[in-house]
């Protein structure tokens, strides 16, 4: 089970919205807080450890997941071509 603790949005840049979200999750052993279908979720801890972010299925149904080359996060590409980038910190 997960709940969103903070959600800050910065829309000061044209055509770009930067959102910072923190979630608190109560996860089973071997799991850790992550993102599934664009929502906070408990995921296999190995996914986080190895930075194989797309294995969490972080994008919405119908979107394509693409790992950033430096493994700092992932992008979700909508069918129309719009790209949403998520970085992990």
């Amino acid at each position: 089970t997960c709940e969103i603790v903070t959600l800050d949005r910065d829309s000061s840049q044209p055509r770009r919205t930067i959102a910072r979200q923190t979630a608190r999750c109560a996860c089973r052993k071997g799991q850790i807080a992550g993102t599934t279908r664009a929502r906070p979720a408990c995921v296999d801890a190995r996914i986080i450890k190895t930075k194989q972010w797309c294995d969490m299925l972080p994008c919405l149904e119908g979107e394509g997941c693409d790992l950033l080359i430096n493994r700092s996060g992932w992008t979700c590409t909508q069918p129309g071509g719009r790209i949403k980038t998520t970085t992990v910190s």
Partner: antibody, heavy 122, light 109 residues
Framework: AVTLDESGGGLQTPGGALSLSCKAS????????MGWVRQAPGKGLEWVGV????????SYGSAVKGRATISRDNGQSTLYLQMNNLRAEDTAVYFC???????????????WGHGTEVIVSS | ALTQPSSVSANPGETVRITCSGG??????YGWYQQKPSSAPLTVIY???ERPSDIPSRFSGSSSGSTHTLTITGVQAEDEAVYFC??????????????FGAGTTLTVL
Amino acid sequence: AVTLDESGGGLQTPGGALSLSCKASGFTFSSYQMGWVRQAPGKGLEWVGVINKSGSDTSYGSAVKGRATISRDNGQSTLYLQMNNLRAEDTAVYFCAKGSASYITAATIDAWGHGTEVIVSS
Amino acid sequence: ALTQPSSVSANPGETVRITCSGGASSGYGYGWYQQKPSSAPLTVIYKDDERPSDIPSRFSGSSSGSTHTLTITGVQAEDEAVYFCGNDDYSSDSGYVGVFGAGTTLTVL
């Protein structure tokens, strides 16, 4: 069957530029990260660089960083490598490589092109 | 860089093991690539132990600690080639970059 067909190699002059292409078939090109690996005569394999599925993100090996640009055209199922300020040490066979899943590393290549030879000489 | 033996030899039917160590513990495993003279590399193992569908089952990959091994069970004459291992290296300058071993020449006696 997966095929990767490179082209564009040949004799290049030092300080010049090259443009290589890799035409892919037999798989959904836009669903895979791709990369370039090269091999100098009588030497081992050297990482050139990679590009993500959408083409929005790239990374390069230290020997070509700042001189190489990898791009892709998902509509044409084609991967590109452009390199400028060529040096004699860029002489090599350049291979196109396909990642096996959502990511390409030197551990996850599952298909290679036949290679195209580049010779940098005056 | 990755460390692997420069050469190994075996008689037909024997089991050959080629080891590889080094690189970053990135979680993406190790790959093994076969290359014959004047040919492109051929993937025999990727992500530690996955084998492409057209590669014979005598090829297998395994890991134990920091050592990664390509095993050819019942080596055949056509397996004579150079084998490269591949993994990642990490630097603050370039991030994760692919790296290969110098290659192991397998001679089938």
